[in-house]
């Protein structure tokens, strides 16, 4: 502890001019005081001021105002200041002298004699009013106060605390009349060496190292660190723990990147026509009537469902068609014959039936031929028959349809996975992506089909933490670690929902 | 009980940068209470505080030397480093790490042994 | 920038008391701490908050800090004592030590 008892002289009067002894000053007693402080005694005895000592220069002649004074010699209230902890009583003696000698340091004179003396015995807490007192004996009467204040920088009730108010990064404070901290705005703590965050900031993904600020954990982001930071390159896909992709509707893949609503994102099918998805990145047009071509972009020719019967041949016009009848045959369609069967109208060995008593007939055709005179030789490839770009051919009787790559089925129909022709090598897991098959090698293999054999194997020291499974070949570091439910980190190296110490920053 | 041990090469050219590194064992370096630093030494004269980190990677740095110095924190390893770049014979010094205690008004408890660093072509 | 003076040596004899200074301006706003270093070894927490000892430091060991002038003070003084002595204090977030005195013990 450390404080200073105070004591202010304010009066002393010797109106006579006398001696304790009885004689008096010539010519006037000039004055000095002693001051002895020392621990309570209920009876003061001679000994040392075991709480401090100290004299003053001559003060006055017989009475006297003593006035205050800051500095120098005669300061005014007397310092008495302690290094321990205040016990709250004391004893206090004043005696009064008079000199011959020095005015300056009358301690040092011979031929001192005593004036008066008084002495105080009692308690007296620290705080800063002072206590005011009057002695007065037969002959002399001395006014004075007193207290006892804490040193710079010690508090409480017996100065015995010491705090310093501070700024710097181990505490951030001012002090307390108890001595206890007071943080400064923005920090906290035992020590106010621990900022307040920016409001709000999550406590376990998010600190700071001054108020009203946000850093986030690997792993985390935005203002307040409340949002997870999804897998490097996780296209259409969102997460509710860091590096996780949890793919939106209609995406799949490890990293939401393949399409799995080809029709509703693209709208690939022109002209009406009807979009079916089949698998990623795969669909299939189905063409209204009049129109042909992978995406149905292609308008057919208005005569090309062959309209015109009997031979007529069909012309295209501006939104319809027109038909040239043969000699024999009228009709929109040519569909009127003003033929029988007395003028052998039936080709290619077809048999005539007499219709409507002779006014007409119909023709009956062998096999591969077709028409009303079955005039026309069967091609199975006019319906377009064959999906997704796939060229029709005629085979006899019947007729085959050629698929472009990627298709099959009787009509091309089919979408056929990029994957299904296995085309990755050596155990390569395949994934079907916008551009093509990508291929997750095991380990010990890479490229693009895993057909080149490592020497260095990326997984081979073990980069995966916490039981993760690492695959090499699919990322610019050569590995990938997928995590086991709990994990996350590129290596899987932070478990879920760590508790507020975890050392996050590597 | 804490230990703190330096480790760094012994000798540096002039002009390039000199590394070091501080391991923690006994304690954890993200404890709350504690700031990690560097002193140097140069022989047969004085201390000189270089900087010091907290385990969130807040720096603090002597601004005759702040120009110069990076100190960076690695929890997962326990360890601290420094880094003074441009060195010059003026540089060379033993080089403690230290432990800085919040509850100790920010008084070194713990240092470690030190490290001579010699700049010399 | 902020700087510690100490005096380059103090001699004491054996059994008797040395005081060592370290000036500063308001020093005494400050908490002072005090490091005693051997040849050849690492410094050595003495005194912290001006007059605190770390557990393990003998009570001959003690300090105070008023004004512009931290002290520390070895009473009944040993040859084990000889050592050099820094004080050390914070300016706001740099640390800052004073030049150093050497104790011998004669």
């Known amino acids: 502890g450390s404080g200073i008892f105070q004591l202010r002289l304010q009066e002393f009067v010797n109106q006579r001019g006398m001696l304790a002894n009885g004689q008096s000053c010539e010519p006037g007693c000039r004055t000095f005081f002693r001051i002895c402080l020392k621990h309570f005694q209920a009876t003061f005895s001679e000994g040392p001021c075991t709480f401090g000592n100290v004299s003053t220069p001559v003060l006055g002649t017989n009475s006297f105002v003593v006035r205050d004074k800051n500095s120098g010699s005669g300061r005014n209230p007397l310092q008495l200041p302690f290094n321990f902890t205040w016990p709250g009583t004391f004893s206090l003696n004043i005696q009064a002298w008079h000199t011959p000698g020095d005015d300056l340091r009358p301690e040092t004179s011979p031929g001192n004699s005593l004036i008066s003396q008084i002495i105080i015995q009692g308690s007296l807490a620290v705080g800063k009013i002072w206590r005011t007192d009057e002695q007065n004996d037969t002959l002399t009467r001395l006014s004075y106060s007193y207290r006892v204040i804490c040193s710079d920088n010690y508090y409480g009730e017996s100065c015995s605390r010491l705090c310093k108010k501070r700024d710097d990064h181990f505490g951030h404070y001012e002090c307390q009349p108890d001595g206890s901290l007071s943080c400064l705005p923005g920090w906290t703590g035992k020590y106010c060496d621990q900022p307040i965050c920016l409001s709000g900031c999550h406590e376990q993904n998010g600190y700071c190292s001054k108020p009203d600020e946000c850093i986030c954990r690997p792993g985390w982001q935005g203002r307040l660190c409340n949002e997870c930071i999804p897998h490097n390159g996780c296209r259409h896909g969102t997460c509710s723990i860091p590096w996780q992709c949890a793919c939106d509707e209609g995406w799949g893949g490890l990293f939401c990147d393949q399409d799995l609503n080809y029709c509703t994102h693209h709208s690939p099918c022109k002209n009406g026509s009807t979009c079916s998805n089949s698998g990623p990145k795969g669909y299939t047009c189905t063409c209204l009537p009049g129109y042909t071509g992978e995406h149905c972009e292609l308008g057919l020719s208005k005569c090309a469902s062959n309209p015109c019967r009997n031979g007529g041949s069909c012309k295209d016009q501006e939104n319809s068609y027109h038909c040239l009848c043969p000699p024999g045959y009228y009709g929109q369609h040519c569909e009127h014959s003003t033929l029988t069967c007395a003028d052998s109208p039936c080709f290619n060995g077809g048999s005539c039936r007499e219709r409507n008593q002779g006014s007409s007939y119909a023709c009956e055709c062998p096999p591969n031929f077709t028409g009303s005179n079955c005039e026309k030789k069967v091609d199975r490839c006019t319906s377009n028959p064959c999906a997704n770009g796939g060229q029709c051919q005629n085979r006899g009787p019947s007729r085959t349809c050629r698929c472009r790559p990627g298709f099959t089925g009787t009509h091309c129909e089919l979408h056929i996975s990029d994957c299904a022709r296995s085309p990755c090598a050596h155990g390569g897991t395949c994934h079907d992506l916008e551009n093509g098959p990508v291929c997750t090698c095991p380990a010990g293999f890479s490229g693009r089909r895993c057909e080149v054999r490592i020497t260095h194997d990326a997984c081979a020291s073990g980069p995966c933490f916490n039981g993760a499974t690492c695959y090499t070949g699919l990322s610019p570091n050569n590995f990938v670690c997928n995590c086991p439910y709990g994990f996350v980190g590129s290596r899987c190296e932070f478990p879920v929902g760590l508790p507020p110490s975890f050392p996050w920053v590597a | 009980e804490v230990q703190l041990q330096e480790s760094g090469p012994g000798l540096v050219k002039p002009s390039e940068t000199l590394s070091l590194t501080c391991t923690v064992s006994?304690?954890?370096?993200?404890?709350?209470?504690?700031?990690w630093g560097w002193i140097r030494q140069p022989p047969g004269k004085g201390l000189e505080w270089i900087g010091d980190i907290y385990y969130t990677g807040s720096t603090y740095y002597n601004p005759s030397l702040k120009s110069r110095v990076t100190i960076s924190v690695d929890t997962s390893k326990n360890q601290f480093s420094l880094k003074l770049s441009s060195v010059t014979a003026a540089d060379t010094a033993v080089y403690y790490c230290?432990?800085?205690?919040?509850?100790?008004?920010?008084?070194?408890?713990?240092w470690g042994q030190g490290t001579l660093v010699t700049v010399s072509s | 920038s902020y700087e510690l003076t100490q005096p380059p040596s103090v001699s004491v004899s054996p059994g008797q008391t040395a005081s060592i200074t370290c000036s500063g301006q308001r020093l005494g706003d400050k908490y002072a701490s005090w490091y005693q270093q051997k040849p050849g070894q690492s410094p050595v927490l003495v005194i912290y908050e001006d007059s605190k000892r770390p557990s393990g430091i003998p009570e001959r060991f003690s300090g105070s800090n008023s004004g512009d002038t931290a002290t520390l003070t070895i009473s009944g003084t040993q040859p084990m004592d000889e050592a050099d002595y820094y004080c050390?204090?914070?300016?706001?977030?740099?640390?800052?030590f004073g030049y150093g005195t050497k104790v011998t013990v004669l």
């Open positions: 050390q204090a914070w300016d706001r977030d740099t640390g800052v």
């Open positions: 230290a432990r800085y205690d919040v509850s100790l008004g920010g008084s070194s408890d713990h």
């Open positions: 006994g304690g954890s370096i993200s404890s709350s209470s504690y700031y």
